[in-house]
């Protein structure tokens, strides 16, 4: 089992918006959950996107979720990662 | 099964403090968020704040910012609930209760009361 | 801070009637984050319907969520003895957290 590195990044989209984009990478085997949250509560599937979970060419994988927030409401966010019974909490960079 | 057991009734002076414990159990404690409401006698449901046991980030209800102090012990899998500067209107039942899939309160904790009397 | 009011306050049926429960909120809320919880006396609030109109486990088919916008609803299609209680409604959607002040669902 190879855990992954979560990074999570932040682009603006439209006024007032924000795009948190949290990418999961070089984990084996390839079976991860990778969501976003609002205080803690896993955000509805319409309101997520999900890249494919790809190879990365070193025997292990990468996958993304992504979702558009308010932004000031960022504190309220925070990516979560299942994989190979760990988990952890990513928060939205400031 | 999913649990959370909350410390036994308190009661207290006005301008004391008093710390509720709760113990969850039952799933990973850091994979969900702990919330905190109160309930007065016959009144509804207060939230407090939560705490993200994880990366220890902590939202506050601002009503409660000045006083209330959420915080986890990892080692124990405890969360805990504090609150200063104790006013009468402090009586109540104390709720722990952690964030679900899919709502803000998916389990509870049996509740702790504070009564607040000189 | 977005108001949630629960209508009516007392609602007094008999065992066998069909319940329903509004809870109007002061700004609109997506229906993603609309739940509704149940206190009996003595006991802790349980999750009842989360997400407007799911069920929570273990909970049984005569309850029943909807709505959107500001207006939702609870409908309890036939009530049974241990459904008397109060039930809550809460919104998820923006800080700070908030719920209806109650409905009682008391024996006529």
């Known amino acids: 089992t190879v855990p992954p590195m979560v990074n999570v990044t932040r682009s603006e989209a439209s006024e007032g918006n924000i795009t948190v984009t949290c990418r999961a990478s070089g984990f084996y085997p390839w079976n991860i959950t990778l969501s976003w949250r609002q205080d803690g509560v896993s955000l509805s599937h319409d309101t997520q996107q999900w890249g494919d979970v790809l190879p990365d060419g070193n025997g292990t994988y990468q996958t993304w979720v992504a979702t558009r927030i308010c932004q000031g409401e960022e504190q309220r966010f925070t990516c979560y990662m299942e994989h190979s019974g760990n988990h952890s909490t990513h928060p939205v960079p400031s | 099964e999913i649990q959370l057991v909350q410390s036994g009734a308190e009661v207290k002076k006005p301008g004391a403090s008093v710390k509720v414990s709760c113990k969850p159990s039952?799933?990973?404690?850091?994979?969900?968020?702990i919330y905190w409401v109160r309930q007065a006698p016959g009144q509804g449901l207060e939230w407090i704040g939560y705490i993200d046991p994880y990366i220890g980030r902590i939202i506050y209800n601002q009503q409660f910012k000045d006083r209330a102090t959420l915080t986890v012990d990892k080692s124990t899998s405890t969360a805990y609930l504090e609150l200063s500067s104790l006013r009468s209107e402090d009586t109540a039942v104390y709720y722990c209760?952690?964030?679900?899939?899919?709502?803000?309160?998916?389990?509870w904790g049996q509740g702790t009361l504070v009564t607040v009397s000189s | 801070e977005i108001v949630l009011t629960q209508s009516p306050a007392t609602l007094s049926l008999s065992p066998g009637e069909r319940a329903t429960l509004s809870c109007s909120a002061s700004s609109s809320i997506s229906s993603n984050y609309l739940h509704w919880y149940q206190q009996k006396p003595g006991q802790a609030p349980r999750l009842l319907i989360y997400?407007?109109?799911n069920l929570a486990s273990g909970i049984p088919a005569r309850f029943s969520g909807s709505g959107s916008g500001t207006d939702f609803t609870l409908t309890i299609s036939s009530l049974e003895p241990e459904d008397f209680a109060v039930y809550y409604c809460?919104?998820?959607?923006?800080?700070?957290?908030?719920f209806g002040q109650g409905t009682k669902v008391e024996i006529k």
């Open positions: 209760s952690r964030s679900g899939e899919r709502s803000n309160f998916d389990y």
């Open positions: 997400r407007t109109s």
């Open positions: 039952g799933y990973a404690f850091t994979s969900n968020n």
């Open positions: 809460q919104q998820g959607g923006s800080l700070p957290l908030t």
